[in-house]
Each structure stands twice: as structure tokens, then as C-alpha cells.
Amino acid sequence: PPNRRTCVFFEAPGVRGSTKTLGELLDTGTELPRAIRCLYSRCCFGIWNLTQDRAQVEMQGCRDSDEPGCESLHCDPSPRAHPSPGSTLFTCSCGTDFCNANYSHLPPPGSPGTPGSQGPQAAPGESIWMAL
């Protein structure tokens, strides 16, 4: 399809690496949220860190290619990694403009489908890229 995908763009302070080069940041006239127009895919992604009491966004932006999950209309995160005990990284991919702004739902920590508490452990920056 000819039209390019536009996604929400965000990178939490301290996150190593950047996906900024996967698109062109847009001037939306507001400070936040930032928007990015994808160069190499029609697919947005989001990564959230779910702890016992809250979900915190880690990264949002464009994927570098279209792959399974990108056909989704909405952001339906799935568990990917354990950056530290008691927290889980959830990621989504989706294929409509700004679909990565928010997730539709997150399963509670420790629920079926969440990696076990002995799942992969990684340093915070590394775990983001594991999730991607």
C-alpha cells in the first residue's frame, strides 16, 4: 500500500539505542505525544514495563520491517522478557496510524501467558532490545 504509516514515538530516559532512524519525526504542533512517519514498514510497536502496581511505557515507534503481528488493528501486548524480578516487558505490533499510543489491555503479572518468574533476566537496556 502506498500510504506511509504514522506512529507515536517515545523513548524513556535511559533506554539504550534508538529507533528514531526508522522514520521521520513529524511536527504535530504539540510537545507530546511525538509522531513518527515510518520509512521501512507500515508497522508500529510499543513496549510497556508492567510491575505489580503500574504499567510504564518504555518505547514507542516504527518497526524496521513488516512481520507477523503488524496486521493487527490494535495494540494487544504480549509478554516478552523479565528485565528484573517483579516486572515484565510487554510488546505489541500493529498496523494503523497511532495504534501504538495505548494498549487495549495487559494481563495481570503472573497470569497465564506471562513468562514464569524464572524467565529471562537482563539489564534494563538489553531487555528492551530482547523485547523488540
Epitope: 502506498p2 504514522t6 532512524t21 513529524l26 520509512l39 520491517s65
Partner: antibody, heavy 117, light 111 residues
Framework: QLQLQESGPGLVKPSETLSLTCTVS?????????WNWIRQPPGKGLEWMGY???????SYNPSLKSRVTISRDTSKNQFSLKLSSVTAADTAVYYC??????????WGQGTLVTVSS | DIQMTQSPSSLSASVGDRVTITCRAS??????????MHWYQQKPGKAPKLLIY???NLESGVPSRFSGSGSGTDFTLTISSLQPEDFATYYC?????????FGGGTKVEIK
Amino acid sequence: QLQLQESGPGLVKPSETLSLTCTVSGYSITSDFAWNWIRQPPGKGLEWMGYISFSGSTSYNPSLKSRVTISRDTSKNQFSLKLSSVTAADTAVYYCAGSRYSWFAYWGQGTLVTVSS
Amino acid sequence: DIQMTQSPSSLSASVGDRVTITCRASESVDTYGNSFMHWYQQKPGKAPKLLIYRASNLESGVPSRFSGSGSGTDFTLTISSLQPEDFATYYCQQSNEDPYTFGGGTKVEIK
């Protein structure tokens, strides 16, 4: 600084495959950017043919998609164009170009390819 | 594909003249208020050179006598005071939709 240099035969016979290579210096083609091919028939305008991205994904102009292939050799920091079943209408100056965004800031000097028997 | 129509196709001007070249797209090249229209200069036997990106942003190293404006479907490249080295052909390019497409060019000649 980033430089691009096209190379390949200047004469190709009708129905054969045109093959060109672009050698990139001063920058790794796997670091960033899209690596494009753009052509310009003599005395005419510019036509974007397609790109290969830093990650290896490709995108082609639908008007050429059935005939064009762009690939890369990361060990040589090169990317290549193949255009099959050429005709006289494919006679053009062929440019390789690097783009961080969706416009073309870095160009090779161009190479003329003539299709003739 | 988005068709890009430049006018005029050629023009004659003198050093010091103000020159305006227009480019009209067959449909809007804006995304959420951002215009994906770019301008290049090409001299005979040379590769095109980027002048303006995203409608109005001057590429590094390009003289300030070049400026761009417009949004939607209608865009303009202006040379405020034509210099001898500005005699060349100018092309617009849109990147709002795939495939990227260029205008047919405007040749600026010496009067």
C-alpha cells in the same frame, strides 16, 4: 564523508539483464539509511527505482517491480541493481543515492547505460 | 502514483532576477500537516543536488537565496536573486506516498 560510486557495463543488449553496483565509502550500509537507485533517460526527468534499507528490506517502484532486484554485499559495503529484459527505453543515466529520510541528500556521479544491439 | 507537474518547463532570466518555479501534485503530499515535498538542482552532466527538503527547509550549505514554500498540492521554489551558478534544471520530488515521484523539471536559462 559519505561517497557513492556506480560501476558496471555501459552497454547492454536488448532482452538481457542490466547489472550495476554502487560502492559506498565513508559509511556502513548496515548502519542506517536507505540505499536507492534512481535513473534519468537522456534529456528527461528522474525516476526512483527502489531501495534496500540498512536492515536489508527492499521497496520497488511498482512500474518496474517485475523486472528489478536490489541486493547488497555487506562485506564489500556495496549494493547492486539488476534490471531484467531491458529495452531501448531503459537507456538512461543510473544514479545510486543514500537517503536518511525520504529525500536524497547523497548521490553518486551517475553512469550511462545504453541498451542497444 | 502521485503525478508532479512543474511550471514553467523552461524560463529565461537575467542575473539578479527573482525566479519562481511551481510544482503541483495530483493529490496532497501532506501528512498530519507536514509537507513531503523536496527540491533539487541539476547541472548538465552532474547528479542532482538537494536544495530544499520538506517544503521549506534549506539543506546545509545551500545559499539562503533559495527558499521553498507551499502545502497540500501547490509548492514554490524561489531564487531571490539569480546568480550565474544558478542556471540549471530544477526538480521537485514528493515522498508522501510510494513510489517517490519527481516533477518533469524546469530549465532556467540565461536571457
